[in-house]
């Protein structure tokens, strides 16, 4: 598993460094999660040919994975810090059920999958501290999430592999879009 943020070699080499700011902590946390996703994607791509598959759209229709759009205020055109922050937090909360699905989907990277899930929870907490308008954040309904999880786990093997691949790919993209927007704030 990657070294948790704040414990990398750069920090050791620079003991005089000021404590991390809120923005730096968020930035490091996202990069840490992206490291984890990278490791999980390696296992997924080695295990099956999903990463080269052209049948992605087929499976993608059944998933409602969060995606950044221009209306969310995270793009340069129409950038709105508060709207964007709400979108990032809401999106991460929506991803949590899919990250739960990823648990038990990996053999050699089981710890890594757990680390990605837990690190995302921490990231959400960091971002909630940064957000002013917490009332605008809608938390997914636990009952809906539970039935979605059951439905995903009941899929055949091919669809489960494809779902895993799509979740990782979409989560990576969402985090990258978030990282880019947060650096503009």
């Amino acid at each position: 598993a990657p070294v948790p943020p704040g414990e990398d070699s750069k920090d050791v080499a620079a003991p005089h460094r000021q404590p991390l700011t809120s923005s730096e902590r968020i930035d490091k946390q996202i990069r840490y999660i992206l490291d984890g996703i990278s490791a999980l994607r390696k296992e997924t791509c080695n295990k099956s040919n999903m990463c080269e598959s052209s049948k992605e759209a087929l499976a993608e229709n059944n998933l409602n994975l969060p995606k950044m759009a221009e209306k969310d205020g995270c793009f340069q055109s129409g950038f709105n810090e508060e709207t964007c922050l709400v979108k990032i937090i809401t999106g991460l909360l929506e991803f949590e059920v899919y990250l739960e699905y990823l648990q038990n989907r990996f053999e050699s990277s089981e710890e890594q999958a757990r680390a990605v899930q837990m690190s995302t929870k921490v990231l959400i907490q960091f971002l909630q501290k940064k957000a002013k308008n917490l009332d605008a954040i809608t938390t997914p309904d636990p009952t809906t999430n539970a039935s979605l999880l059951t439905k995903l786990q009941a899929q055949n093997q091919w669809l489960q592999d494809m779902t895993t691949h799509l979740i990782l790919r979409s989560f990576k993209e969402f985090l990258q879009s978030s990282l880019r927007a947060l650096r503009q704030m």
Epitope: R169, Q176, L179, R183
Partner: antibody
Framework: QVTLKESGPTLVKPTQTLTLTCSFS??????????VGWVRQPPGKALEWLAF???????YYSPSLESRLTITKDTSKNQVVLTMTNMDPVDTATYYC??????????????WGQGTLVT | DIQMTQSPSSLSAFVGDGVTMTCWAS??????LNWYHQRPGEAPELLVF???NLQIGVPSRFRGSGSETYFTLTINSLQPEDSGTYFC?????????FGGGTKLEI
């Protein structure tokens, strides 16, 4: 192998619009984390960043030139186009297109075109 | 906008020597800094990304370090092909900005 190549006029009259095309191969501009930017360099001077377009069509422009610049992409053709209106003799420079592609968005241009001199 | 300042603007050294050039950012950019090398008549080439990571294929005699507002690029055991201009780049946020460059003569 990743390659980029700029094309467009070498000579532009004052007040005219410059249209530059960056044709690339070896990567896709629909892959997350990938972007293409334009950078120019007047003779004997430093590099100046102009514009950038991401895989998801998010676009960024140099604030001092924003009103004159437009960047677009055609993913199917593997091309990025930069237009610059109201050209002036001070815009004489070598114009480069370059790729940025890494998981952590370090905004580093790892591959550059050969550049095209616009006078 | 984040301003990038490079020092010195030019320097001269012999083959085998070691040199260090510096780059300052007008505000903290964490480790989001890239270094490029440009030979006359050629396109720039990425040397170092994220302050200290060597780009694939770049010789280990190059070393980038620093964080927040102060960064350095050190070249040990200079080779004739190292001549040219070195640019640092703010890679933290848009607008991306380059330093004025350090011209190295071997």
């Amino acid at each position: 192998q990743v390659t980029l190549k700029e094309s467009g006029p070498t000579l532009v009259k004052p007040t005219q619009t410059l249209t530059l095309t960056c044709s690339f191969s070896g990567f896709s501009l629909s892959t997350s984390g990938v972007g293409v930017g334009w950078v120019r360099q007047p003779p004997g001077k430093a590099l100046e960043w102009l514009a950038f377009i991401w895989w998801d069509d998010d676009k960024y422009y140099s604030p001092s030139l924003e009103s004159r610049l437009t960047i677009t992409k055609d993913t199917s053709k593997n091309q990025v186009v930069l237009t610059m209106t109201n050209m002036d003799p001070v815009d004489t420079a070598t114009y480069y297109c370059a790729r940025s592609a890494d998981d952590y968005l370090y905004y580093s241009f790892d591959t550059w075109g050969q550049g095209t001199l616009v006078t | 906008d984040i301003q990038m300042t490079q020092s010195p603007s030019s320097l001269s050294a012999f083959v085998g020597d070691g040199v260090t050039m510096t780059c300052w950012a007008s505000q903290s950019i964490n480790d989001y800094l890239n270094w490029y090398h440009q030979r006359p008549g050629e396109a720039p080439e990425l040397l170092v990304f994220a302050a200290s990571n060597l780009q694939i294929g770049v010789p280990s005699r190059f070393r980038g370090s620093g964080s927040e507002t102060y960064f350095t690029l050190t070249i040990n055991s200079l080779q004739p092909e190292d001549s040219g201009t070195y640019f640092c780049q703010n890679a933290h946020s848009f607008p991306l900005t380059f330093g004025g460059g350090t011209k190295l003569e071997i």
